[in-house]
């Protein structure tokens, strides 16, 4: 409980709101309202949010803190930032994984799960765009590989191997004849 504050307070302003009988100063972020002020324009009694709870903004009426969210292990989520008294846990995906939204109109609060990023190297392709907010964008086949169907096939190492037209163009067999 604070001492006597300056009497100039506006109940309709940002800093003081009518709580119970009087216009009271709100609680800072990370604190909840234990008891409203006991005099006009006084300080409310505010307590720090207990562990695993938070309040992100200055508030006047919150008599309890919000529970911190737990990242969904089933959806392969990890905590990018742990919960504090003033901020909720920030869940995301570990390196090498990307966010796949579970709803069509995706916003920051939308439910999501984590998918492993495509490894372009394992597909013998160039990495055109690195995986972060969406899956890796793979480009053309790496040197020594040619497009065949949906994948990249290794250039044959001898003339005995069959080398279709696309293979010949990439692997350079045509020049050998």
């Amino acid at each position: 409980q604070g001492g006597t504050r300056s009497p100039r307070c506006d109940c309709a302003g940002d800093f003081h709101k009518k709580i119970g009988l009087f216009c009271c100063r709100g609680c800072p972020a990370g604190h909840y309202l234990k008891a409203p002020c006991t005099e006009p324009c006084g300080n409310s009694t505010c307590l720090v949010c207990p562990q695993d709870t938070f309040l992100a903004w200055e508030n006047h009426h919150n008599s309890e803190c919000a529970r911190c969210q737990a990242c969904d292990e089933q959806a392969s989520q990890v905590a990018l930032e742990n919960c504090s008294a003033v901020a909720d846990t920030r869940c995301g995906c570990k390196p090498g994984w990307f966010v796949e939204c579970q709803v069509s109109q995706c916003v920051s609060s939308s439910p999501f799960y984590c998918q492993p990023c495509l490894d372009c190297g394992a597909l013998h392709r160039h990495t055109r765009l690195l995986c972060s907010r969406r899956d890796t964008d793979c480009g053309t086949c790496l040197p020594g590989f040619y497009e065949h169907g949906d994948g990249c096939v290794s250039c044959p190492t001898s003339t005995l191997g069959s080398c279709p037209e696309r293979c010949a163009a990439v692997c350079g067999w045509r020049q050998m004849f």
Partner: antibody, heavy 123, light 111 residues
Framework: QVQLQQSGGGLVQAGGSLRLSCAAS????????MSWVRQAPGKGLEWVAT????????YFPDSVKDRFIISRDNAKNSLFLQMNSLRAEDTAVYYC????????????????WGRGTLVTVSS | DIQMTQSPSSLSASVGDRVTITCRAS??????????MQWYQQKPGKAPKLLIY???NVESGVPSRFSGSGSGTDFTFTISSLQPEDIATYYC?????????FGQGTKLEIK
Amino acid sequence: QVQLQQSGGGLVQAGGSLRLSCAASGFTFTSYAMSWVRQAPGKGLEWVATISDGDSYSYFPDSVKDRFIISRDNAKNSLFLQMNSLRAEDTAVYYCARDRIYGSVQYYAMDYWGRGTLVTVSS
Amino acid sequence: DIQMTQSPSSLSASVGDRVTITCRASESVEFSGTSLMQWYQQKPGKAPKLLIYAASNVESGVPSRFSGSGSGTDFTFTISSLQPEDIATYYCQQSRKLPYTFGQGTKLEIK
């Protein structure tokens, strides 16, 4: 006209409980904070509890905090005082009163009072 | 808590006398230019009745012989011409901050 009709007083053993009621009429009950004030036999007035109008926050002096509960039923224009863990020193006439707010100064005065109800706590 | 000290604790006066009761608060009860102080009258066996609010404002329906004055910590309640029906105990009370506190009362008797 404004009326505050009290009930629920009586004799109770120390450690016991009692619930006082105050039925309000003649004014818009929801627009007023309400209080309880007590007076021990032959003694002065002592504020016991107040409940705010809109959000029903409650306030108590240290002498009754954690033992008394003030509540209101706006639908029934009624005020209540639940008194638990009663002690001999809680023996008094209990009055309910309306708190009128004056102007924009957040200033309250008890402008109407009930007739009082006697609570006797025997040890 | 704000302590309210009232004096005298009792007094005897004659009908027609000017009667003065004082009340001192342990700290200022001023807020935003208003003294958050009131005076109540309690007749024997009856509930208290509000007479004066904000130190000097006479409640509606209260006879004009009752008045109040003062600011900060020192307040005075006056009956300009005592009437037989004024026999009662008078209390000051502050609303500056909780807990609300009353003076111990002044018992007024007719000589």
